[in-house]
């Protein structure tokens, strides 16, 4: 059963992000806000504290368009924002194990 202390690291984190974000791709860090000059990355948020699917979604490269608002243009991101390709090794069954924990 899922425990709040469970975390996602390494390949498990990568695979889960790949499934959640699909062909949108994902980032490992977001731009620092004006309030906090330091940006917290997905590794900090999910590998060292519990994280959920909603949090993972925020690291996807382009927001998924909702059925109600298909006209919304994709978010424009800085040119220097690192964009990591979806790995060639991803396996659905592997991701399923991780995501089932996060859904509980």
């Amino acid at each position: 059963a899922y425990r709040p202390s469970e975390t996602l690291c390494g390949g498990e984190l990568v695979d889960t992000l790949q499934f959640v974000c699909g062909d949108r791709g994902f980032y490992f860090s977001r731009p620092a806000s004006r309030v906090s000059r330091r940006s917290r990355g997905i590794v900090e948020e999910c590998c060292f504290r519990s994280c959920d699917l909603a949090l993972l979604e925020t690291y996807c490269a382009t927001p998924a368009k909702s059925e109600r608002d298909v006209s919304t243009p994709p978010t424009v991101l800085p040119d220097n924002f690192p964009r990591y390709p979806v790995g060639k090794f991803f396996q659905y069954d592997t991701w399923k194990q991780s995501t089932q924990r996060l859904r509980r």
């Epitope: 975390t7 996602l8 690291c9 390494g10 390949g11 498990e12 984190l13 990568v14 695979d15 490992f28 860090s29 990355g41 997905i42 590794v43 900090e44 590998c47 060292f48 690192p82 964009r83 990591y84 390709p85 790995g87 090794f89 991803f90 396996q91 069954d93 592997t94 194990q97």
Partner: antibody
Amino acid sequence: EVQLLESGGGLVQPGGSLRLSCAASGFTFSRYWMIWVRQAPGKGLEWVSSIRSSGETKYADSVKGRFTISRDNSKNTLYLQMNSLRAEDTAVYYCARGPLSDYYDSSGYYFDAFDIWGQGTMVTVSS
Amino acid sequence: DIQMTQSPSSLSASAGDRVTITCRASQSISSYLNWYQQKPGKAPNLLIYTTSNLQGGVPSRFSGSGSGTDFTLTISSLQPEDFATYYCQQGYSFPLTFGGGTKVEIK
């Protein structure tokens, strides 16, 4: 040359303490996960602990609460503080370089292996 | 925790032989599997990362394959310097775990 050099091993009594150091050179130490792995005499490899560039840590259950991994990025040095030592902690301790902090290499592909290793330092726990 | 099981634990072979070592994970680890070579009295040396990627400087006679739970390290033509112990290691999740090792000895 990329290099890791451990020091601080020795003979210690059960219940005692020891602090291992690992001096890194030839790469940007502050960008990488660093790892301690040990190997008991005649046995296989056992992961002990990992520390991310910004200081977050992970431990094997067998050492949790007794060992503390830390790093000084300004000195390019990794440490392992070992307290409440037991006979079963007797091993060669290796430090190793892990992946970049966010797991991806410079070409943008996932990399998670331990690619640089020190020569090891022997820790013997015996009365 | 993910258990890694290597087989065989030891094998005897001659120079020129094709050698295959297998590693099995207790649950799927996708392709996050690394292989190391260790010689007596020396530190391990990374051979292959993420199942099939050859580390720089490693001879092309070494190759890796597999996915999910079953992985293989193959040495296409064993050389005298290849007699050593080989370990697999999963990078899928903490705690990071190694296989028990496979010792390749001279026949």
